[in-house]
């Protein structure tokens, strides 16, 4: 591994702090905050150039002061180089309790995977300790203040700082971002890069050509007066170490959306159609709303077009208030801030048959006492084609007497216009209503016809219905 050739190397190859015998061999230990020093030797004087300890205690005032020796302070090196530095301290043998040296960076203890070694050089006066720290291939994250700490006689001693400044190519903290813009409308792009080293200068590039002849200091805001077509912008960040280029971003011109596609009918009822579609390309501007256009397909003339507006999402709309059993042509168009898309291809859709719109007419009710049945008759209602094919009738009959209430209904087929139902309760009132049924559903009920059912044979007959137009009772 090649190490950066700086004055730092003297910290390893140069003379050690304090007086050590020439033939003295050090012993080493990997860094741990729990390293124990060897037994202290005889006393000696303290070296002159030391960093003042950060903490003092009453007990320690009885002993000569001990502090880390001065070392390199501000290390400047390039990214990916190797660096090594150290802390050293001389502990006289008068100090009985000492713990190992720990390394700290920006206020946090460095534990684990850092390459540090502590070397001990004992002699007759005490022990010299050197804590070596090395970083291979430094990165920006290695920038910061490094300190050594150790406890001597329960007093924490902190070294002077070693500030590691890793210099490299500019590093982007804000790159231009893709934006969609209105044609010929001004917009801004921002680019910010940092060192060290500083300053960082910015050049803007549009479609591979430089925009500004003179660089701007980071951060830089480029105001583009307007574009008529899509362009690609990037920024170059320069410092003394070289150049970094940002990502290229596409600036798109907003246009009207493409027409929706895949218009489908999901469900039809007699009076509504549920339609879905796939939005077309949004034209680089969010779709705001959509318009469903509906026209009757059967009309020979250009019938009026019904327009239903809805939000752009979900891509679904229920068209309501349509005629039953009718054919319609349907298309969809959507808009963004620029304008409306062309309409989608028209598709055909049909509503199903509806329920009858008119109740049966001329309802009469008779009591057949001998058979104990009600005889009910009516006239078939005038059913339109879109109401569908008549399939039968529903007869509702409600029986009421003192303390009793019974609500019943029967369905009868469309053959004929009469029905018989058994008497349920005597000495009661029976209310009869009839509705026509088609495949489209059940129509409205007729006006009620009441009949009083006597205890034995007295009958009060009360027909109550509107005669069909043009018909007379016989």
């Amino acid at each position: 591994e090649k190490w950066e050739e700086t004055e730092l190397d003297q910290l390893f190859s140069g003379p050690l702090p304090g007086r050590l015998p020439v033939n003295h061999r050090p012993f080493s230990a990997p860094h741990s905050s729990r390293d124990q020093l060897p037994p202290p030797q005889t006393g000696r004087s303290h070296p002159a150039h030391t960093a003042a300890p950060q903490v003092t205690s009453t007990a320690s005032k009885l002993l000569p002061p001990v502090a880390f020796n001065h070392t390199i302070g501000h290390i400047v090196l390039s990214e990916h180089k190797n660096v090594k530095f150290n802390c050293s301290i001389n502990i006289p043998n008068t100090y009985q309790e000492t713990a190992g040296i720990s390394w700290w960076k920006d206020g946090k203890e460095l534990l684990g995977a850092h390459h540090s070694i502590t070397q001990f050089y004992p002699d007759e006066e005490g022990v010299s300790i050197i804590a070596l720290f090395s970083i291979a291939s430094v990165q920006r994250s290695d920038n910061g203040s490094y300190f050594c700490k150790m406890k001597v006689n329960n007093r924490e001693i902190v070294s002077d700082p070693i500030y590691v400044e890793v210099q490299g190519l500019p590093y982007f903290i804000k790159q231009p971002e893709s934006v969609n813009v209105t044609r010929n409308t001004a917009f801004n792009l921002t680019c910010q890069a940092v060192g060290p080293p500083e300053p960082v200068n910015i050049f803007w590039v549009q479609n591979s050509s430089r925009v500004n002849e003179k660089p701007e200091r980071s951060p830089s805001v480029l105001t583009v007066p307007g574009l008529t077509e899509t362009a690609v912008f990037s920024c170059e960040a320069h410092n003394d170490k070289g150049l970094t280029v940002s990502k290229g971003v596409h600036i798109n011109i907003k246009v009207i959306p493409s027409p929706p596609t895949e218009v489908h009918i999901l469900n039809s009822t007699a009076h509504s159609i549920l339609v879905s579609w796939v939005p077309g390309f949004d034209g680089y501007s969010p779709l705001q709303n959509c318009s469903i256009q509906v026209k009757e397909a059967d009309r020979l003339s250009n019938g009026s077009v019904m327009v239903f507006n809805t939000s752009a999402s979900p891509h679904l709309y229920e068209i309501q208030q349509l005629q039953a059993l009718a054919n319609y042509s349907i298309a969809v168009s959507c808009r963004n801030e620029i304008g409306w898309s062309a309409v989608s291809p028209w598709i055909l859709a049909s509503t199903t048959e509806g329920a009858p719109s008119v109740a049966p007419l001329n309802i009469t009710v008779f009591l057949n006492e001998s058979n104990n049945i009600l005889d009910i008759r009516w006239t078939k209602p005038p059913i339109k084609r879109q109401d569908g094919e008549l399939v039968g009738y529903r007869i509702s009959h409600v029986w009421e007497s003192a303390g009793t209430y019974k609500e019943l209904s029967e369905e009868v087929s469309q053959n004929g216009s009469w029905a018989q139902i058994p008497v349920q309760i005597h000495n009661a009132t029976c209310t009869v209503r009839i509705a026509a049924i088609t495949k489209g559903g059940i129509g409205p009920f007729s006006e009620p016809v009441n009949i009083i059912i006597p205890e034995h044979s007295k009958v009060d007959y009360a027909p109550s219905s509107t005669p069909a137009p043009g018909n007379t009772d016989s």
Partner: antibody, heavy 122, light 111 residues
């Protein structure tokens, strides 16, 4: 990146005065900002600094006489609590050289404002 | 506090010549030292940091050296544009405080 001082004016002794440093393109949560003054025809005099974390440090002579505070994401104030004629000077704000989310560090000054003149006179 | 003593207070030299400015710290500041250039009516501009590292855009005619308590700024091949006042600054710090201080300044006159 730029800095600009404002608030410099003529005041009488004892009248508190607040100067404001407004930054552009500088993230005050990443950089320290310091104040330095220069009396007419004299040298530069360090007053104090506010770190990226908001910790303040003052020169010994300036403690109690000046207060530095971050008032927004783009402004830092220097309050001269009880000015005397000796405080007549051009006051500069300057950005610390290194970005870092720590309370202390090597604070030499990389970018300076043009300065604002404060005159303390009767 | 750390006190920075700068000498000389003023120095004169001819175009093409060399000037040397010295700065002494009252205690060891390792290499936490910066040099600034200031011209009349302008704010200072950093020339050198970490005692010997040239700031961006500064010509290599400016050279810083020293460590501990003794520092030197040397300007060689003097140009008229170098006429200015030069200041040293300690930016030493500890784990609990910072010790910023400027020297008194040296005026460089280029004739």
């Amino acid at each position: 990146q730029s800095l600009e001082e404002s608030g410099g004016r003529l005041v009488t002794p004892g009248t508190p005065l607040t100067l404001t440093c407004t930054v552009s393109g500088i993230d005050l949560s990443s950089y320290a900002l310091g104040w330095v003054r220069q009396a007419p025809g004299k040298g530069l005099e360090y007053i104090g600094i506010i770190s990226s974390t908001g910790t303040t440090y003052y020169a010994t002579w300036a403690k109690g006489r000046f207060t530095i505070s971050k008032t927004s994401s783009t402004t830092v104030d220097l309050k001269i609590t009880g000015p005397t004629t000796e405080d007549t000077a051009t006051y500069f704000c300057a950005r610390g050289a290194y970005a870092g989310y720590v309370a202390f560090g090597p604070y030499y000054f990389h970018i300076w404002g043009p300065g604002t003149l404060v005159t303390i006179s009767l | 506090d750390i006190v920075m003593t700068q000498t000389p207070a003023s120095v004169e030299a001819a175009v093409g010549g060399t000037v040397t400015i010295k700065c002494q710290a009252s205690q060891s500041i390792s290499n936490f030292l910066a040099w600034y250039q200031q011209k009349p009516g302008q704010p200072p501009k950093v020339l050198i940091y970490a005692a010997s590292h040239l700031a961006s855009g500064v010509p290599s005619r400016f050279k810083g050296s020293g460590s501990g308590t003794q520092f030197t700024l040397t300007i060689s091949d003097l140009e008229c544009a170098d006429a200015a006042t030069y200041y040293c600054q300690s930016y030493f710090y500890s784990s609990t405080s910072i010790y910023n201080a400027f020297g008194g300044g040296t005026e460089v006159v280029v004739r």
